[in-house]
C-alpha cells in the first residue's frame, strides 16, 4: 500500500490521543535504553510503511503484535485516514486469520515495539533531518 495520500496530521492526532500510551504500557518494566533503534524512516509515508510492517507482519521470535490493542488502533487509524487502505487489507487479514497465534510477550516483541515507538516519534517530527 502507498501511504502517500494519507491524512498525516489526523494520524498524528490519533497516535497522540489513542495509541502512544498503549505502546508505553506494553513496554512497561523495560528500560528506555535497553534496545537500540535499528529501524529508521525518512519521511511520513516511509514511516507508515515501516510501522505497518513491524506492527502487522509476523517476525521470527515475535508473531503476535497484530492482536495487541495498539495494533488494533493503528489498523483503525490507517483505515480511516488512508484512502483505499481498508480495501487492500481485507485479503491480507483473511490470510492472517488462518495463522493467528496466541498473544505472548517475548523479548523480541519488546524490541520490536521499541522500534515502533521510534518510528512513531520520527513520524511525528517529519521536518527533522535524518540522523
Amino acid at each position: 500500500y502507498d501511504f502517500t495520500n494519507c491524512d498525516f496530521e489526523k494520524i498524528k492526532a490519533a497516535y497522540l490521543s489513542t495509541i502512544s500510551k498503549d505502546l508505553i504500557t506494553y513496554m512497561s518494566g523495560t528500560k528506555s535504553t535497553e534496545f537500540n533503534n535499528t529501524v529508521s524512516c525518512s519521511n511520513r509515508p516511509h514511516c507508515l510503511t515501516e510501522i505497518q510492517s513491524l506492527t502487522f507482519n509476523p517476525t521470527a521470535g515475535c508473531a503476535s503484535l497484530a492482536k495487541e490493542m495498539f495494533a488494533m488502533k493503528t489498523k483503525a487509524a490507517l483505515a480511516i485516514w488512508c484512502p483505499g487502505y481498508s480495501e487492500t487489507q481485507i485479503n491480507a487479514t483473511q490470510a492472517m486469520k488462518k495463522r493467528r497465534k496466541r498473544k505472548v510477550t517475548t523479548n523480541k516483541c519488546l524490541e520490536q515495539v521499541s522500534q515502533l515507538q521510534g518510528l512513531w516519534r520520527r513520524f511525528n517530527r517529519p521536518l527533522l533531518k535524518q540522523q
Epitope: 490521543s17 489513542t18 512497561s28 488502533k73 489498523k75 483503525a76 487489507q89
Partner: antibody
Framework: QVQLVESGGGLVQPGGSLRLSCAAS????????MSWVRQAPGKGLEWVSG???????YYADSVKGRFTISRDNSKNTLYLQMNSLRAEDTAVYYC???????????WGQGTLVTVSS | DIELTQPPSVSVAPGQTARISCGGD??????VYWYQQKPGQAPVLVIY???KRPSGIPERFSGSNSGNTATLTISGTQAEDEADYYC??????????FGGGTKLTVL
C-alpha cells in the same frame, strides 16, 4: 450529516431470535470499526460486540455464542443476529461508530428489544 | 480483566466543581473516555484520550487519569449538566468496558 439508524427491535419470547440492523450514512462506513452497545431499563451501558472493516469480530462474554455481528459494506449496514434470547437481554440496543477501536463518537437513537413470555 | 468502578451518585451546587471518579486496576496505563447521557437520549462523548474534549463540548469539562483512578471534572457546574456520566476503557482481551455510571445531581 453523520447518522446511524437502528431497526428490528421488538418483543420476542425467551429462546427466540431477532435481527437488528443499523443503516449508516454521512461517512465512509467501510473504514470504521462499528459496535453494538446495549442499556437495560434503568441500568448502565454494556458493550455487546464490534466488527472491523475486514469482518473480524469481537464479543462480550455475556453474548458469546448467542449473538453474531456482521456488516455489509456495500449497503453501509451493520447487523446483530441475536439467538437464544434471555430476559436479561432486554435493553435498548445502540449502534455505534467506535473511533480508533476505542471511544464511541457517533451513536444511533437506539432500538428496544424486549424478551418476555 | 479490568472492571471500572464509579460512585452511583454525586451532588453539586450550581457554580461549584463536580468530580466524578472512575477506578480500575492500573487504569492509568490505559486511555479513558467519558460520556454524558440525559434521560431518553443516546450518550454523548465529553472526554476522550483521558483529557481531550471533542469539538462542541464546553471548556468546563476536563479529565485526568493516573494510577488507578480517572476523574471527570466539571467546573462551574450548570443545571444542564445534570445527567448520568459513564467512564469507558478497554481490556487486554480487546473488548470495551464501561463503568456502572454516576448520576450527577445539580442541587
Amino acid at each position: 450529516q453523520v447518522q446511524l439508524v437502528e431497526s428490528g427491535g421488538g418483543l420476542v419470547q425467551p429462546g427466540g431470535s431477532l435481527r437488528l440492523s443499523c443503516a449508516a450514512s454521512g461517512f465512509t462506513f467501510s473504514s470504521y470499526y462499528m459496535s453494538w452497545v446495549r442499556q437495560a431499563p434503568g441500568k448502565g451501558l454494556e458493550w455487546v460486540s464490534g466488527t472491523f472493516f475486514d469482518g473480524s469480530t469481537y464479543y462480550a462474554d455475556s453474548v458469546k455464542g448467542r449473538f453474531t455481528i456482521s456488516r455489509d459494506n456495500s449497503k453501509n449496514t451493520l447487523y446483530l443476529q441475536m439467538n437464544s434470547l434471555r430476559a436479561e437481554d432486554t435493553a435498548v440496543y445502540y449502534c455505534a461508530r467506535q473511533q480508533y477501536f476505542d471511544h464511541i463518537d457517533i451513536w444511533g437513537q437506539g432500538t428496544l428489544v424486549t424478551v418476555s413470555s | 480483566d479490568i472492571e471500572l468502578t464509579q460512585p452511583p451518585s454525586v451532588s453539586v451546587a450550581p457554580g461549584q466543581t463536580a468530580r466524578i471518579s472512575c477506578g480500575g486496576d492500573s487504569l492509568g496505563g490505559k486511555y479513558v473516555y467519558w460520556y454524558q447521557q440525559k434521560p431518553g437520549q443516546a450518550p454523548v462523548l465529553v472526554i476522550y484520550g483521558d483529557s481531550k474534549r471533542p469539538s462542541g463540548i464546553p471548556e468546563r469539562f476536563s479529565g485526568s487519569n493516573s494510577g488507578n483512578t480517572a476523574t471527570l471534572t466539571i467546573s462551574g457546574t450548570q443545571a444542564e449538566d445534570e445527567a448520568d456520566y459513564y467512564c469507558q476503557s478497554y481490556t487486554n482481551a480487546l473488548s470495551t468496558v464501561f463503568g456502572g455510571g454516576t448520576k450527577l445531581t445539580v442541587l
